[in-house]
Interface confidence: low
């Protein structure tokens, strides 16, 4: 099938980085500056993505691949392919409708993005609090009195992160 197609369609011979130029007897022409074709047989080249403003270039555009953007310092990527940049907050804060807000008592965030998550409830595992939590750090759970035997583990991993959003319907 491929062989038949290439006999019928000269454009299928045009490699990535070129396009099949209808104005020039369907010969393979290189993509013009600031454009690319990532697959063969293209009849046009795509315009390169430009990383402007809060976006900065992570990977330059080439004749065969689009540019890739990331975000300037103080921002992080959101959206598929970093289509948006969201401002960072400090550790101990979360981004809300009204900007960066400190984590409420009993919650923490150890990153510049994401949400404040509840401290681990040590007592659910029969443990005690070894180190108190802060806005930036989870509590550290220590062994319960019954666990104080040789070889007992003294720290438990933090609980899974609470997912953001509001209460389910």
């Amino acid at each position: 099938f491929e062989r038949t197609r290439s006999l019928q369609d000269p454009c299928s011979n045009c490699p990535a980085g070129t396009f099949c130029d209808n104005n020039r007897n369907q010969i393979c022409s290189p993509c013009p500056p600031n454009s690319f074709s990532s697959a063969g047989g293209q009849r046009t080249c795509d315009i390169c993505r430009q990383c402007k403003g809060v976006f900065r270039t992570r990977k330059e555009c080439s004749s065969t691949s689009n540019a890739e953007c990331d975000c300037t310092p103080g921002f992080h990527c959101l959206g598929a392919g970093c289509s948006m940049c969201e401002q960072d907050c400090k550790q101990g804060q979360e981004l809300t409708k009204k900007g960066c807000k400190d984590c409420c008592f009993g919650t923490f965030n150890d990153q510049k993005r994401g949400i404040c998550r509840p401290w681990t409830n040590c007592s659910l595992d029969g443990k005690s609090v070894l180190v108190n939590g802060t806005k930036e750090r989870d509590v550290v759970c220590g062994p319960s009195p019954a666990d104080l035997s040789p070889g007992a583990s003294s720290v438990t991993p933090p609980a899974p992160a609470r997912e953001p959003g509001h209460s389910p319907q």
């Epitope: 598929a80 392919g81 948006m84 969201e86 981004l95 809300t96 409708k97 949400i115 953001p164 509001h166």
Partner: antibody, heavy 129, light 110 residues
């Protein structure tokens, strides 16, 4: 390439059922809120349902509550919409759309600030006898 | 009946600047951010503006969004024939507790 591809639409009689699927590729599906939006012929956009990245939070429009069920399988990078007790007014093109997982908690879905940045091509559902 | 109100149609000639309005209320536009979507004939909607005035990467700077009180607007400068499409505004409604859209504006380039 970032892509959403819907399937499962078709002609169904009133009272019947359909299951729509939306296959995601080119991005980390499990990081994204997913939404179904529909558009009746010649009409505007209508939000149908949303589901959070790990299915903890699910929302429905009043017009479909109790009849439609949204779900996702992150291992298969696929979103679903099970539609039961279909009515003529459910006739529409159904789009799936993605939104980065929200940052910020409380009674406001901060994620909506970012709109819906990737859309599928849509699948037509026709409910008619 | 859409929660947000848009004019059903708008038009302009190539090179002109056109503005599309989106009117809402205290529970939606005033208290939340507005997104704008472009839907070219026979295709899916595309995000054009988010957070009232931010353009996703790849959207030309001819498109700009703004918000004041309970209204938002989308401005398109240097109008081109390829801008002929339906445009929708969308936001969150705190009272309805769901996303809401305008009814759409059909833009014709004369």
């Amino acid at each position: 390439e970032v892509q959403l591809l819907e399937s499962g639409g078709g002609l169904v009689q009133p009272g019947g059922s359909l299951r729509l699927s939306c296959a995601a590729s080119g991005f980390t599906f499990s990081d994204y809120y997913m939404t179904w939006i529909r558009q009746a012929p010649g009409k505007g956009l209508e939000w149908v349902s949303s589901i959070s990245s790990s299915s903890s939070y699910i929302y429905y429009a009043d017009s479909v509550k109790g009849r439609f069920t949204i779900s996702r399988d992150n291992s298969k990078n696929t979103l679903y919409l099970q539609m039961n007790s279909l009515r003529a007014e459910d006739t529409a093109v159904y789009y799936c759309a993605s939104t980065q997982t929200p940052y910020g908690s409380g009674n406001y879905p901060i994620y909506y600030y970012y709109g819906m940045d990737v859309w599928g091509q849509g699948t037509l559902v026709t409910v008619s006898s | 009946q859409s929660v947000l109100t848009q004019p059903p149609s708008a038009s302009g000639t190539p090179g002109q600047r056109v503005t599309i309005s989106c009117s809402g209320s205290r529970s939606n536009i005033r208290s939340n951010s507005v997104s704008w979507y472009q839907q070219l004939p026979g295709t899916a909607p595309k995000l054009l503006i988010y957070g009232n005035s931010n353009r996703p990467s790849g959207v030309p700077d001819r498109f700009s969004g703004s918000k004041s009180g309970t209204s938002a607007s989308l401005a398109i400068s240097g109008l081109r024939s390829e801008d002929e499409a339906d445009y929708y505004c969308g936001t969150w409604d705190d009272r309805l507790n769901r996303p809401v859209f305008g009814g759409g504006t059909k833009l014709t380039v004369l």
